[in-house]
């Protein structure tokens, strides 16, 4: 029967007895950087070549014996994951393995380098179709071996790695913390977290998703028709490496932030426990574990979208957190969240000629988040309109004025300390979608774009009474663009999205006073795009 | 890696050249910088990898190389350029002792040194 | 759950030898290295050897070096450490350990064993 | 193997909070990960920290470590009876290719 890890990656519709996907990823070349590999497995063979690039540091210990089988273990188990006969995912990629650990398993960001390099002149020199890296291995926070992959990346070249086996955030880590990078967590036939003995899967907003990791049976270098279970983030990087190598084949000229988008959005949501991670980290960490798309062609009408999480920003007054959309992903929109409430806002910005998202911590926070929507919108012109402060009874307001452009985000920045809670809530009359609305006391900013067929919509979700989460989420054929809370006010840790649903934090209940003052409304923008739908309905 | 511990090759004299003149001293106010990993075990010290601002050339990159080693050498330190880079980042890999990070930081076109570390499979 | 299970109290003659044995259970055996502890009446720990996870690799305290062999059967979950010319002042409790991860954490220990008596007196 | 240093003994009334001190070199504490440990009485060690400052699941969070220069802390607040108990540092030498402990520190709860 299907192995465990192949049918959860697998949508229903082709579920059987057999694992048969309908492009087994033969357009594409996976790169594997890890321990070298027994390329004639019977998996494997004729399937992976091995390249002569070799970087790795001597073993330790006072008495090693090189074993070939042991050397070879990590590297094979994985080339099997990726393409294997029987138990890989893309069954129709080729590979080429490069040795950047040695047989312990120990390597070095100077020789990864180096390795990442070998593939880049191999691109040059040979160009081949979409190429995809695995790095299954980490180290500690690399800005070098970062940029090198933020290079790699930008020249068309997609890198899957694992988030690391060391139940921590993955942002302390390299690759992993790379942001072009697709980071992998591991979960098992749960659906829950890999545990490895006292550590685990890392976790954090570094993290694009989960796949299978634990008890993933694969290729043995034991003998040549041998196989063997292994567990950790590295086989859940294989799985994402095989799904994209799929997907490349189908698609292959998805660009890097296309593939995101679509492994994002065709993953299972909500099915991890997420008690298993540390509560700070708990709305941080995407609960998403991937699977192969239920077709292959066809996603293109959609209007895709993700949230980017900043660093934490820190404890101090004039603090300030970034969140940033990858180059090819346009900002529509930007929120904040504070886990203690105090927060002045957040505002869209232009930075290097591209839209970021800067949360302001205020004075005795703990700091910030700035949370971003990133989206794939082509042919898409957007700008931030903002008005200042309006000390108007009736709160600030802003709204799209200039032709053809549609409102996907609302923003809202105040200088002084706490907004008043006293006041009464604004809500936004009703026939105006264009229309940010907020607090007096704030400066409010709209985010406005046109693009082809680009429609949008507010939707709202309010209570009276006090509530620590409020949500409203956009209906089927809409796309989660903008999420807001109305009112401002000091109660409010702040809103973020969650896939298509936007999610308002209140402080606990217990501590808010009286009901008006815990009045919340969760607002949601919901976009979609007809021209994108028209395009793809003509494609078939 | 070809070399162990100590087994230094390409041993450069203290010759003055042109290379270790001050001509393109580095830009006014740019500060390279020093990483190493947070994590101290999986530090690697006497390895450090020399990343070169954006658009340096090879012939730079190679040059700047060359530089560090004489300017090293008249110092009485031992070096070895184990790698350069080029096609993804320019720079090159340093094998040297951690007295000389001074000195290397203040060389042209350096952006960052970052000491090499651990990766392990996962 | 997670378990390390060790054999029976020991008593021996100076000059003899004696095989302590520790069973694990409940986990993934051999992808963990693993540790040898022991503990002299009313004294502290004392850290005798460690045994990577496929048996590839070992380091020995200085005390346990020429005398002591650590070794592991992964097909039964099992390690050993063999003693072998015992002096008096290896009477102690001998613990087996998990070290904690992979090869970036081996010199941590997570789950222990309930302990070995070994006795060595005329 | 020489052993990293840890004061004989440390006491404290309920809900305070002791500190313990774990000095080594260099070659050890300096530059390696630090673990600490707790032995009940007449029970096998139980790992408290590890990699300096984090608490494998289950253990409490009034247990937390530092490190600064060759000396590493383990700081219990919150002190309870149930934590009285010897505490041991342990840290890989890199000089001496070992893991190394400390001399153990027996912590009472006074009253």
């Known amino acids: 029967s299907i192995p465990w890890n192949l049918e959860r990656i697998t949508p229903p519709r082709y579920r059987a007895d057999e694992y048969q996907p309908p492009d087994g990823g033969s357009l594409v070349e996976v790169y594997l950087l890890d321990t070298s590999i027994q390329s004639d497995h019977r998996e494997i063979e004729g399937r992976v070549m091995v390249t002569d690039f070799e970087n790795v540091p001597e073993e330790d210990g006072t008495r090693f014996h090189r074993q070939a089988s042991k050397c070879d273990s990590h590297g094979t188990h994985l080339a099997g994951v990726v393409s294997g006969r029987d138990a890989g995912v893309a069954k129709g990629a080729s590979m080429r393995s490069l040795r950047v650990l040695n047989c312990q398993g120990k390597g070095t960001v100077s020789g990864t380098l180096i390795g990442l390099e070998f593939i880049r002149k191999s691109q040059l020199v040979q160009p081949v179709g979409p190429l995809v890296v695995l790095l299954p291995l980490a180290g500690g926070y690399s800005r070098v071996l970062n940029a090198a992959c933020q290079r790699l990346a930008s020249a068309g070249v997609v890198l899957v790695t694992a988030a690391g086996n060391f139940r921590d955030d993955a942002c302390l880590y390299s690759p992993a913390s790379a942001p072009e990078v697709i980071t992998v967590g591991a979960t098992n036939a749960q659906d829950q977290p890999v545990t490895l003995g006292t550590l685990g899967t890392n976790f954090g907003r570094c993290v694009d998703l989960f796949a299978p990791g634990e008890d993933i049976i694969g290729a043995s270098s034991d003998c040549s028709t041998c196989f063997v279970s292994q567990s950790g983030t590295s086989q859940a990087a294989a799985h994402v490496a095989g799904i994209a190598a799929m997907m490349l084949s189908a698609e292959p000229e998805l660009t890097l932030a296309e593939l995101r988008q679509r492994l994002i959005h065709f993953s299972a949501k909500d099915v991890i426990n997420e008690a298993w991670f540390p509560e700070d980290q708990r709305v941080l960490t995407p609960n998403l574990v991937a699977a192969l798309p239920p077709s292959t062609h066809g996603a293109g009408w959609q209007l895709f979208c993700r949230t980017v999480w900043s660093a934490h920003s820190g404890p101090t007054r004039m603090a300030t957190a970034v969140a940033r959309c990858a180059p090819d992903e346009e900002l529509l929109s930007c929120s904040s969240f504070s886990r203690s409430g105090k927060r002045r806002g957040e505002r869209m910005e232009a930075q290097g000629g591209k839209l970021v998202c800067r949360a302001h911590n205020a004075f005795g926070g703990e700091g910030v988040y700035a949370i971003a929507r990133c989206c794939l919108l082509p042919q898409a012109n957007c700008s931030v309109h903002t008005a200042p402060p309006a000390e108007a009874s009736m709160g600030t307001r802003v709204h799209c004025h200039q032709q053809g452009h549609v409102l996907t985000g609302c923003s809202s920045h105040w200088e002084v300390e706490d907004l008043g809670t006293h006041k009464p809530p604004v809500l936004r009359p009703r026939g105006q979608p264009n229309q940010c609305v907020g607090h007096r006391e704030a400066s409010i900013h709209a985010s406005c774009c046109h693009a082809p067929g680009l429609e949008c919509k507010v939707k709202e979700h309010g209570i009276p009474a006090p509530q620590e989460q409020v949500t409203v989420a956009c209906e089927e054929g809409w796309t989660l663009t903008g999420c807001s809370a109305l009112p401002g006010t000091s109660h409010v840790l702040g809103a973020y999205a969650v896939d298509n649903t936007c999610v308002v934090r209140s402080r606990d209940v217990s501590t808010t006073g009286s009901t008006s003052e815990g009045a919340v409304t969760a607002v949601a923008i919901c976009c979609r795009s007809r021209h994108l739908a028209q395009a793809s309905q003509e494609l078939q | 890696q070809e070399d162990e511990d100590g087994d230094y090759e390409e041993l450069v004299l203290a010759l003055r050249s042109e290379e270790d003149g001050l001509a393109e001293a580095p830009e006014h106010g740019t500060t390279a910088t020093f990483h190493r990993c947070a994590k101290d075990p999986w530090r690697l010290p006497g390895t450090y990898v020399v990343v070169l601002k954006e658009e340096t050339h090879l012939s730079q990159s190679e040059r700047t190389a060359r530089r560090l080693q004489a300017q090293a050498a008249r110092r009485g330190y031992l070096t070895k350029i184990l790698h350069v880079f080029h096609g993804l980042l320019p720079g090159f890999l340093v094998k040297m002792s951690g007295d000389l990070l001074e000195l290397a930081l203040k060389l042209p076109h350096v952006d960052y040194i970052e000491e090499d570390s651990s990766v392990f499979a996962q | 759950q997670v378990q390390l299970v060790q054999s029976g109290a020991e008593v021996k003659k100076p000059g003899s030898s004696v095989k302590v044995s520790c069973k694990a259970s409940a986990f993934t055996f051999d992808s963990f290295g693993m540790h040898w502890v022991r503990q002299a009446p009313g004294q502290g720990l004392e850290w005798m050897g460690l045994l990577w996870s496929d048996g590839s690799g070992e380091y020995y305290a200085d005390s346990a070096k020429g005398r002591f062999t650590i070794s592991r059967d992964n097909s039964k979950n099992t390690l050993y450490l063999q003693m072998n010319s015992l002096r008096s002042d290896d009477t102690a409790v001998y613990y087996c350990?998990?070290?904690?991860?992979?090869?970036?954490?081996?010199?941590?220990?997570?789950?222990w064993g309930q302990g070995t008596t070994v006795t060595v007196s005329s | 193997q020489s052993a990293l240093t840890q004061p004989p003994s440390v006491s404290g009334s309920p809900g305070q909070s002791v500190t313990i001190s774990c000095t080594g070199t260099s070659s050890n504490i300096g530059n390696q990960f630090v673990s600490w440990y707790q032995q009940l009485p007449g029970t096998a060690p139980k790992l408290m920290i590890y990699?300096?400052?984090k608490r494998p699941s289950g253990v409490p969070d009034r247990f937390s470590g530092s490190k600064s220069g060759n000396t590493a802390s383990l700081t219990i607040s919150g002190l309870q009876t149930g934590d009285e108990a010897d505490y041991y540092c342990g840290s890989w030498d890199s000089s001496l290719s070992g893991y190394v402990f400390g001399t153990g520190t027996r912590v009472t709860v006074l009253g």
């Open positions: 990699e300096y400052n």
């Open positions: 350990a998990r070290a904690m991860g992979a090869i970036y954490y081996y010199y941590a220990m997570d789950v």
